[in-house]
């Protein structure tokens, strides 16, 4: 194996901090898995830098990442998903920094979708439902979900509920009447696989009914 880098490039490179982080997404595109890495310092000069993964692969010893602006990624079926891989930042043949990582411990699920809230007048509650692509997956099937909701006027006052199913009931009496609420959900691996929270789903907005003065009940939306 042979690569090259100008001496000046290497000397400059050694002054930089090449800390990086990565996450994997399993069966993100059919049976294809993905691995995404990025430098923690957004100001690092990435011109001649490449990422390479070696070990715990099928068919090949090492794979080169593809660069897309500031991120580096691989999409392939060829992750063994057993044992640790060595991920290195390289300039030519020289490794600047490496991490040994088990790809099953850095899993970032796909964001939940189709979040919706339905008010049940008779039950005086709100049924929150959402979907996740992970129900159809072979590997990362078991997730913990974090549903977060807030009154729209309360900028940072989120209430969080953790659940393992994709359905949640919010009691009407726990919410303010005649108020606009924002709700969103994210997921994290919860069995065998470890990793990070997914991105948040798109937010859903709903309004609580007003209180009916005679009965003390809220009006439906």
């Amino acid at each position: 194996e042979s690569g090259y880098a100008q001496n000046g490039d290497l000397e400059d490179a050694e002054l930089d901090d090449y800390s990086f982080s990565c996450y994997s997404q399993l069966e993100v595109n059919g049976s294809q898995h993905s691995l995404t890495c990025a430098f923690e310092d957004p100001d690092v000069n990435i011109t001649n830098l490449e990422f390479e993964i070696c070990g715990a692969l099928v068919e090949v010893k090492c794979l080169n990442f593809r660069k897309l602006q500031e991120i580096y990624f691989i999409e392939t079926k060829k992750f063994l998903l057993i044992g640790k891989s060595n991920i290195c930042v390289k300039v030519g043949e020289k490794s600047l920094t490496c991490k040994k990582i088990d790809l099953t411990t850095i899993v970032k699920p796909e964001a939940p979708f189709d979040l919706s809230v339905v008010y049940r007048e008779g039950a005086n509650d709100f049924v929150v439902t959402f979907n996740t692509s992970h129900l159809q997956k072979k590997y990362v099937k078991v997730l913990m979900h974090d549903v977060a909701y807030r009154q729209e006027k309360d900028e940072n006052k989120w209430t969080h509920v953790n659940l393992s199913s994709t359905k949640l009931t919010l009691l009407q009496r726990k919410l303010q009447p005649a108020a606009m609420y924002e709700i969103k959900v994210r997921s994290i691996p919860d069995h065998y696989f470890k990793g990070f929270w997914s991105e948040w789903s798109p937010s859903y907005y709903f309004r609580t009914p007003e209180i009916n003065n005679s009965s003390g009940e809220m009006d439906p939306i």
């Epitope: 194996e1 042979s2 690569g3 090259y4 001649n48 490449e50 692969l57 099928v58 068919e59 090949v60 010893k61 090492c62 794979l63 080169n64 990442f65 593809r66 660069k67 691989i74 392939t76 060829k78 390289k90 300039v91 030519g92 043949e93």
Partner: antibody
Amino acid sequence: AVQLVESGGGLVQPGGSLKLSCAVSGFTLSDYYMAWVRQAPKKGLEWVATISASGLRTYYPDSVKGRFTISRDDAKRSLFLQMTSLKSEDTATYYCARPMSAHYGFNYFDYWGQGVMVTVSS
Amino acid sequence: DIQMTQSPASLSASLGETVTIECRTSEDIYNGLAWYQQKPGKSPQLLVYSANSLHIGVPSRFSGSGSGTQYSLKINSLQFEDVASYFCQQYYDYPLAFGSGTKLEIK
């Protein structure tokens, strides 16, 4: 349709130099690793050089390391092989080859050029 | 470096017969193996990759199998157009390496 067309072959004396070119069409060159493979007359195939999709990394067998240099010009849709200090055992048909899979480095080749003959002889 | 041992060097078979070409590697290549067909005066053509995946357009009478260090290419119901040389290639690691080839002829 994908096409790879080699040029630049010919007769050269031992110790001499030659630069082969491969003009590509029908695909985005910058998405692919590219390689040169050679075949001596009536012999088997021998891998000669590979260059990564970014052009930042090159790979050679010991038999040509230090003598051959693979390079690419994606804007001109061309791959090159600069050969120096040529020996009689470098006599072969040289093929430009493209891996089937883009980007990452799965080096099995689904497209080959027609080949160009290099003869090293005094 | 990974060494490739391909056998037999030549093979003569009758039309309609089944033939098998073997390729052995000096270390486990985790299915990083391809097979090529080369007809006289032509460039090689990919037949099989990932040890057992048939390349698009290749007749189904060709099949690849194997794992670890032992791989094979089988041609069922031999046809006249199968007369060619066949090469295995490991792409698990650099340096990439080809087998020495098998020349297939019709009896």
